[in-house]
C-alpha cells in the first residue's frame, strides 16, 4: 500500500510542471537568453556591470518531507530555496551550453545559501519499526555572494548545480551531498 500522506497544518508549496522551483534556462550555442524564459526582460550585455542591489536574491519557502530509505518524517520541514540572479551572467564562448555561469576573468555574484540550521526530525518507519531520529541541515538564509577566479571548480559546482534544467516532466534529482552531510535526503515533493 505504501505511505499514506501525512495530514498536518504545515503550509505546502506544490510544484506544478515548469513552475516552482524554476532553474535558469540552459544556454545553447550562439544564443542569448530567451526573453520569454527571462521574465520578458532583455538579456544583459555579458560585460555590463550593475549594482548588486539591482538584482533579486529571493528566499522561497518549501515544505518537504525528510526520507531515509523506507522511513519518512512525521512532519514536513520548511527549507529555503535560494532563487534569483544577483548579477549579469558572465559567460565565455567556450562555456556556453555547458551550464557554466561564471566568467573566470571577473567577479560574479550568486544567490546562494548564506546560513544553515540544524533540525532534529523523527522518522516514522513502516512495519512497526522503531522511529529513528535524524539531524538535517537546512538552508536558513540566502545571500548574494561574490565569486572570483580563485574559487575552484568544486566550490562553483555547489553554487552552480541549479543551472542545469531538469528533464521536462521528470523529478529534479536532489543534489548529492558530501560524505559528512546527512544521509536523510530532503524529498523533492513539497
Amino acid at each position: 500500500q505504501g505511505w499514506q500522506a501525512f495530514k498536518n497544518d504545515a503550509t505546502e508549496i506544490i510544484p506544478e510542471l515548469g513552475e516552482y522551483p524554476e532553474p535558469p534556462p540552459e544556454l545553447e550555442n550562439n544564443k542569448t537568453m530567451n526573453r520569454a524564459e527571462n521574465g520578458g526582460r532583455p538579456p544583459h550585455h555579458p560585460f555590463e556591470t550593475k549594482d548588486v542591489s539591482e538584482y533579486s536574491c529571493r528566499e522561497l519557502h518549501f515544505t518537504r518531507y525528510v526520507t531515509d530509505g523506507p522511513c519518512r518524517s512525521a512532519k514536513p520541514v520548511t527549507e529555503l530555496v535560494c532563487s534569483g540572479q544577483c548579477g549579469p551572467a558572465r559567460l565565455l564562448p567556450n562555456a556556453i551550453g555547458r551550464g557554466k555561469w561564471w566568467r573566470p576573468s571577473g567577479p560574479d555574484f550568486r544567490c546562494i545559501p548564506d546560513r544553515y540550521r540544524a533540525q532534529r526530525v523523527q522518522l516514522l518507519c513502516p512495519g512497526g519499526e522503531a522511529p529513528r531520529a535524524r539531524k538535517v541541515r537546512l538552508v536558513a538564509s540566502c545571500k548574494c555572494k561574490r565569486l572570483t577566479r580563485f574559487h575552484n571548480q568544486s566550490e562553483l559546482k555547489d553554487f552552480g548545480t541549479e543551472a542545469a534544467r531538469p528533464q521536462k516532466g521528470r523529478k529534479p534529482r536532489p543534489r548529492a551531498r558530501s560524505a559528512k552531510a546527512n544521509q536523510a535526503e530532503l524529498e523533492n515533493a513539497y
Epitope: 500522506a5 495530514k7 503550509t11 505546502e12 506544490i14 506544478e16 513552475e19 515544505t63 529534479p172
Partner: antibody
Framework: CQSVEESGGRLVTPGTPLTLTCTVS????????MGWVRQAPGKGLEYIGI?????NTYYPTWAKGRFTISKTPTTVDLRITSPTTEDTATYFC?????WGPGTLVTVSS | DVVMTQTPASVEAAVGGTVTIKCQAS??????LKWYQQKPGQRPKRLIY???TLTSGVPSRFKGSGSGTDFTLTISDLECGDAATYYC??????????????FGGGTEVVVK
C-alpha cells in the same frame, strides 16, 4: 512528451456520484501537483482543489465535502459526491501550463 | 482561503493600444500568481507565472508585475488575436485549514 486528458464526463441525475479521471503521460505525479478546475457555461474558471506530489489534498471551503481528489501513479480522479444542477460545467485537470481539453458534466433530472 | 478580486470585468481598446488588468489577493501571496488567457471554446493558456515570469513562447508584449496582494497584467501593442478573457490565479501555499488556490473573476478584453 507530456499530455493531460480528462474523461468520465456525462449526463447524470442530481445526487448520483460521478468520478472524473485525468490521465497523464510523461508527468511525474509523485512530484508535481495536479489541480482540478471547472467552468460553468458562460462563466469564469473556478478552482476545485489540488493534490500534491505526496498525496495531500487541498480544497477551497466551498468545495470541501462536495469533491474528493485521489490519484494513482498515472491518473488523478475527481469524485463529485452528490452532484447538483449547479455542478454542470466543463471540468479541467491541470498542472502548470499543461491543461486537458476538459470533460463536460451535465447534471439534470 | 485566499480570494482573488480582478478588475475591470471588461475592457475595450484599439489595436496597438495598451490594456491594464488588476488583480488583488485577500491576503499576501508573495509572487505565487499566474495569468491565463482563454478564448471561447478553448482551454486556458498560461501566460505568466511567479507574478512576472513569462511562459516560453509568449510574446514580451505581455507583462506581469506585483507581489504581496496587488498584481497587474499589462498587454501592450494590442493585436486582434489578444481578444480573450484573462484570469489571474493564486497558487500560494496551502494547509489543511486554508487553500491558497483561487481564480479571479476574469476580464474580457475586446480589441477594436
Amino acid at each position: 512528451c507530456q499530455s493531460v486528458e480528462e474523461s468520465g464526463g456525462r449526463l447524470v441525475t442530481p445526487g448520483t456520484p460521478l468520478t472524473l479521471t485525468c490521465t497523464v503521460s510523461g508527468i511525474d505525479l509523485s512530484y508535481y501537483g495536479m489541480g482540478w478546475v471547472r467552468q460553468a457555461p458562460g462563466k469564469g474558471l473556478e478552482y476545485i482543489g489540488i493534490i500534491s506530489g505526496i498525496g495531500n489534498t487541498y480544497y477551497p471551503t466551498w468545495a470541501k465535502g462536495r469533491f474528493t481528489i485521489s490519484k494513482t501513479p498515472t491518473t488523478v480522479d475527481l469524485r463529485i459526491t452528490s452532484p447538483t444542477t449547479e455542478d454542470t460545467a466543463t471540468y479541467f485537470c491541470a498542472t502548470g501550463d499543461f491543461w486537458g481539453p476538459g470533460t463536460l458534466v451535465t447534471v439534470s433530472s | 482561503d485566499v480570494v482573488m478580486t480582478q478588475t475591470p470585468a471588461s475592457v475595450e481598446a484599439a489595436v496597438g493600444g495598451t490594456v491594464t488588468i488588476k488583480c488583488q489577493a485577500s491576503q499576501s501571496i508573495s509572487t505565487y500568481l499566474k495569468w491565463y488567457q482563454q478564448k471561447p471554446g478553448q482551454r486556458p493558456k498560461r501566460l505568466i507565472y511567479s507574478a512576472s515570469t513569462l511562459t516560453s513562447g509568449v510574446p514580451s508584449r505581455f507583462k506581469g508585475s506585483g507581489s504581496g496582494t496587488d498584481f497587474t497584467l499589462t498587454i501592450s501593442d494590442l493585436e486582434c488575436g489578444d481578444a480573450a478573457t484573462y484570469y489571474c490565479q493564486s497558487n500560494a501555499g496551502s494547509s489543511s485549514s486554508s487553500c491558497g488556490y483561487a481564480f479571479g473573476g476574469g476580464t474580457e478584453v475586446v480589441v477594436k
